[in-house]
Interface confidence: medium
C-alpha cells in the first residue's frame, strides 16, 4: 500500500530548488528494494520537470516557482517497481494543490465607465455599476475579495459627496439632492477597487456620469410685450415674432416651446413654433375685420412639449395687434339674386333693384353700379340706385343666351375708395314663358319614291313651354289635301305621318301645312316635297320644277 500525505505547495515560492514537498512510500519496501517514479502533467508531460522524485527515497520535489493563476492543481501518478522492474504497487494518483498568494491586483473591466442620471434624482437612485475582477483565489482566500470606493468627485459641487458606491457590488447611487444639469451637466468620479476586502492591492478607474435633462426650467418670454399690425381680411399673415429662452437642453421636448393664446375664442390667430430657434410666430388664422374690431390685445402663454417636472410658473406675454383698414369690395346681398319675370316684360320697365353693401363702414363711400355681363344686351342699370330695367325685349326662347329658362347677368358695384374696389353680383332672370312661338314642322324637305312610296314622319316643334305646346293640330291647306293625307303619329300629336293619296309624277311639290298649338297659336309652313324615280324608301332625287299646292305645274 501507498503512504502519501496530502500535498500542497504555495505559489511563488523562493528557492533554492528543487525543494522537497513530501516523501512517498510503499509498504512493499519492507520486502525489498523499491524504486519510485512519477508521471503526468508537470512530470513527464508539459510542463515537463516541474515535479521530480528521488528514485530510491521517494522524495517528491518541486523544481521551480508555481503560478496558481496558470495551473492551480497538478495530477500526477506515482509508480513503485522492484529491482527486477516489476511493479510492486498499482499506480497511485497524487493531487498537488497550488495555494494562492495575493499576487494579482484587481483589474477594472474598462478604464472609463459611463452612466447617466436625471437631474433632480432623489437619494437612492441607482446611476451605474462599475466592475473589477481579480485573478487570485476568491474561494479559499480574501485575495480576490474586492471592495469598491470613490476616491474623488469632480466637480465637488453642489456637494463633494453627490454619489456613493456599494463596496461589494460597485453600484453607484445618488446620495445627495441637488443634481442640476443646467449647473453641472457631468461628474467625473475616480473609483478604486481593492482586494483583501479593501486592505490589499488596489486599482482605479474613471466613472463619467452625465446628468440628463428634465423639464425643470420653463420657457420665459423676453420681452413680455409685443406690438404688431396686420391688414384686414388676410389669413396666414405673420404679425410678430415672440422670443423665449429656456435653460433646458436645446432641441429636446423640454426645451421646445408650445405657445397658447389664452383669449382667442374666435380662433382668429395662431402661434407656430420655429423649430430652429424656438421663436413663436404669431399669424392670422383667418382674415380679421377692421370694421368689427380695430385692435386685439392677446395674452400668450408658453409651455413645453412635455409637462414641467416640477411646479413652475408659466410665462405669459401680451401682444397688441392693430388691424389696418383696407378698402373692401362692395358686397351684393345676396351674392346671387333670382328674379322671376315674364319674357314679354315691357321694355324700359324696372325688373328689380340689386344693391350692394359697403363693408367699409368707417369710410363715407359712394357705390356705382354697372352691368358687366349682359350677353343679349337686354338690361340697363341705374348707376346710383342699382335699379335694373329692360332696354330690349326679353326672349325665353333665345337659346344662345338663355339656359333652362334662366338668363344670367353679372352686375358690378364699384366704390370710390383708394384704390377702388369692385364687387360682383349675379342676377338670374327666370323667364316665364308666353306663347310667342307657333309650331313648326321638322323636317321641311321631304322625299318620296314614285313607286310604292313609304309614308314620311314629320315632327312638330314648338320652342315654348307647356301648356303653350302640344297637343298640336295639323291641317293641309291651299288644296294640298287633294293629293296628300296626314294623320297623327302619337297620342300627344307631336308628330304626323304624310303620304300621297295616289301615284304622283316625278318632280318637286310644295305643300302648305297649318300647325296650331294647344293655345291656338298657328302658323302655315310650306313643305318642300320631292318625288323621285325610285321605289319604296326615297334615295337621292334629281331637282325638278316646284309644284304649287301639291299640284305639279308645268314649267
Amino acid at each position: 500500500d501507498w503512504v502519501i500525505p496530502p500535498i500542497s505547495c504555495p505559489e511563488n515560492e523562493k528557492g533554492p530548488f528543487p525543494k522537497n514537498l513530501v516523501q512517498i512510500k510503499s509498504n512493499k519496501d519492507k520486502e525489498g528494494k523499491v524504486f519510485y517514479s512519477i508521471t503526468g502533467q508537470g512530470a513527464d508531460t508539459p510542463p515537463v520537470g516541474v515535479f521530480i522524485i528521488e528514485r530510491e527515497t521517494g522524495w517528491l520535489k518541486v523544481t521551480e516557482p508555481l503560478d496558481r493563476e496558470r495551473i492551480a492543481t497538478y495530477t500526477l501518478f506515482s509508480h513503485a517497481v522492484s529491482s527486477n522492474g516489476n511493479a510492486v504497487e498499482d499506480p497511485m494518483e497524487i493531487l498537488i494543490t497550488v495555494t494562492d498568494q495575493n499576487d494579482n491586483k484587481p483589474e477594472f473591466t474598462q478604464e472609463v465607465f459611463k452612466g447617466s442620471v436625471m437631474e433632480g434624482a432623489l437619494p437612492g437612485t441607482s446611476v451605474m455599476e462599475v466592475t473589477a475582477t481579480d485573478a487570485d483565489d476568491d474561494v479559499n482566500t480574501y485575495n480576490a475579495a474586492i471592495a469598491y470606493t470613490i476616491l474623488s468627485q469632480d466637480p465637488e459641487l453642489p456637494d463633494k459627496n453627490m454619489f456613493t458606491i456599494n463596496r461589494n457590488t460597485g453600484v453607484i447611487s445618488v446620495v445627495t439632492t441637488g443634481l442640476d444639469r443646467e449647473s453641472f451637466p457631468t461628474y467625473t468620479l475616480v473609483v478604486q477597487a481593492a482586494d483583501l476586502q479593501g486592505e490589499g492591492l488596489s486599482t482605479t478607474a474613471t466613472a463619467v456620469i452625465t446628468v440628463t435633462d428634465t423639464n425643470d426650467n420653463p420657457p420665459i418670454f423676453n420681452p413680455t410685450t409685443y406690438k404688431g399690425q396686420v391688414p384686414e381680411n388676410e389669413a396666414n399673415v405673420v404679425i410678430t415674432t415672440l422670443k423665449v429662452t429656456d435653460a433646458d437642453a436645446p432641441n429636446t421636448p423640454a426645451w421646445e416651446a408650445v405657445y397658447t393664446i389664452l383669449n382667442d375664442d374666435g380662433g382668429q390667430f395662431v402661434v407656430t413654433t420655429n423649430p430652429v430657434n424656438n421663436d413663436g410666430i404669431l399669424k392670422t388664422a383667418k382674415g380679421l375685420d377692421f370694421e368689427a374690431k380695430q385692435q386685439y390685445i392677446l395674452h400668450v402663454a408658453v409651455t413645453n412639449v412635455v409637462p414641467f417636472e416640477v411646479s413652475l410658473t408659466t410665462s405669459t406675454a401680451t401682444v397688441t395687434v392693430d388691424v389696418l383698414d383696407v378698402n373692401e369690395a362692395p358686397i351684393f346681398v345676396p351674392p346671387e339674386k333670382r328674379v322671376e319675370v315674364s319674357e314679354d316684360f315691357g321694355v324700359g320697365q324696372e325688373i328689380t333693384s340689386y344693391t350692394a353693401q359697403e363693408p367699409d363702414t368707417f369710410m363715407e363711400q359712394k357705390i356705382t353700379y354697372r352691368i358687366w355681363r349682359d350677353t343679349a344686351n337686354w338690361l340697363e342699370i341705374n348707376p346710383d340706385t342699382g335699379a335694373i330695367s329692360t332696354r330690349a325685349e326679353l326672349d325665353r326662347e333665345d337659346f344662345e343666351h338663355v339656359k333652362n329658362s334662366t338668363y344670367t347677368a353679372l352686375i358690378i358695384a364699384t366704390d370710390n375708395g383708394s384704390p377702388v374696389a369692385t364687387g360682383t353680383g349675379t342676377l338670374l332672370l327666370i323667364l316665364s314663358d308666353v306663347n310667342d312661338n307657333a309650331p313648326i314642322p321638322e323636317p321641311r324637305t321631304i322625299f318620296f319614291c314614285e313607286r310604292n312610296p313609304k309614308p314620311q314622319v314629320i315632327n312638330i316643334i314648338d320652342a315654348d313651354l307647356p301648356p303653350n305646346t302640344s297637343p298640336f293640330t295639323a291641317e293641309l291647306t291651299h288644296g294640298a289635301s287633294a293629293n296628300w293625307t296626314i294623320q297623327y303619329n302619337d297620342p300627344t300629336q307631336e308628330s304626323i305621318i304624310l303620304k300621297p293619296k295616289m301615284a304622283l309624277e316625278v318632280g318637286d311639290y310644295k305643300i302648305n301645312l297649318k300647325l296650331m298649338d294647344n293655345q291656338n297659336k298657328d302658323q302655315v309652313t310650306t313643305l318642300e316635297v320631292s318625288v323621285c324615280d325610285c321605289e319604296g324608301a326615297a334615295g337621292v332625287c334629281r331637282k325638278a320644277q316646284p309644284v304649287e299646292a301639291g299640284l305639279q305645274i308645268p314649267a
Partner: antibody
Amino acid sequence: QVQLKESGPGLVAPSQSLSITCTVSGFSLTSYTISWVRQPPGKGLEWLGIIWTAGATNYNSALKSRLSISKDNSKSQVFLKMNSLQTDDTARYYCARYSKDYYAVDYWGQGTSVTVSS
Amino acid sequence: DIVMTQSPSSLAVSVGEKVTMSCKSSQSLLYSSNQKNYLAWYQQKPGQSPKLLIYWASTRESGVPDRFTGSGSGTDFTLTISSVKAEDLAVYYCQQYYNYPYTFGGGTKLEIK
C-alpha cells in the same frame, strides 16, 4: 335686450288664410332684416321669406303665390300673411332677425304653433 | 333653388367623443367679392328655437363653446364637435344665404349613448 315674439291664431281651417304678427324689441326694424321660417311637427326648417330694412321682400318660390310679408317700423311689427292653407301648412312659425354683419340669423323668436284643421 | 344635403341624418355618440357632420350644397357658396362662404350652422335643442353656432362657414358666434368648429369651402362643409357633452343633444341644421330662397339642410340629429 333683443327679443322677437310671434302671435298667431293657433288653429286655421283649410282653405282659409293665416296672419301672424312678429313684435320685436331691443332693436329697430329700420336697421335689421327679418325673416320667417317654419317647421312642421317632427320635421326640418323651411325658409319662407325675408323683408329688408327698406321694405323690399323676397319669398320662397314654392310659396310665393300665397305668401305676403310686410311691416310697420313705428310699431316694431312684422306681418306674415298666407292664403289657401292646407293641412301640410301645419307648423311652428318663427320670425328671426338677420345680423347686419354676416346675414345669418342671430336671434329667433320662440315661434307660434299653427294647426290647419277642420 | 340651392339644395342643401346633410349627412348623416342621425348619429349616436358617447360623452367625450368627437363627432363630425357633413353639409353639401348643390352649388358653390363661396362669394368671390369677399372670399366668404355664405353658410351658417344652427343648433336646435328639443322644444327650443334654433340657435346660431357658426356663420361664414367657420366663424364661431360669440358665446359658442370652442368645441364647436365649422370648416369647408365651396360646396362641402363640416361641423365638428371635438368632445361631445350631454347638453349637445340637438338637431343641427346648415343653411345657405347665398341666393333666395335661403334653404336649410334636412338636419342631423345628435343623440347621446
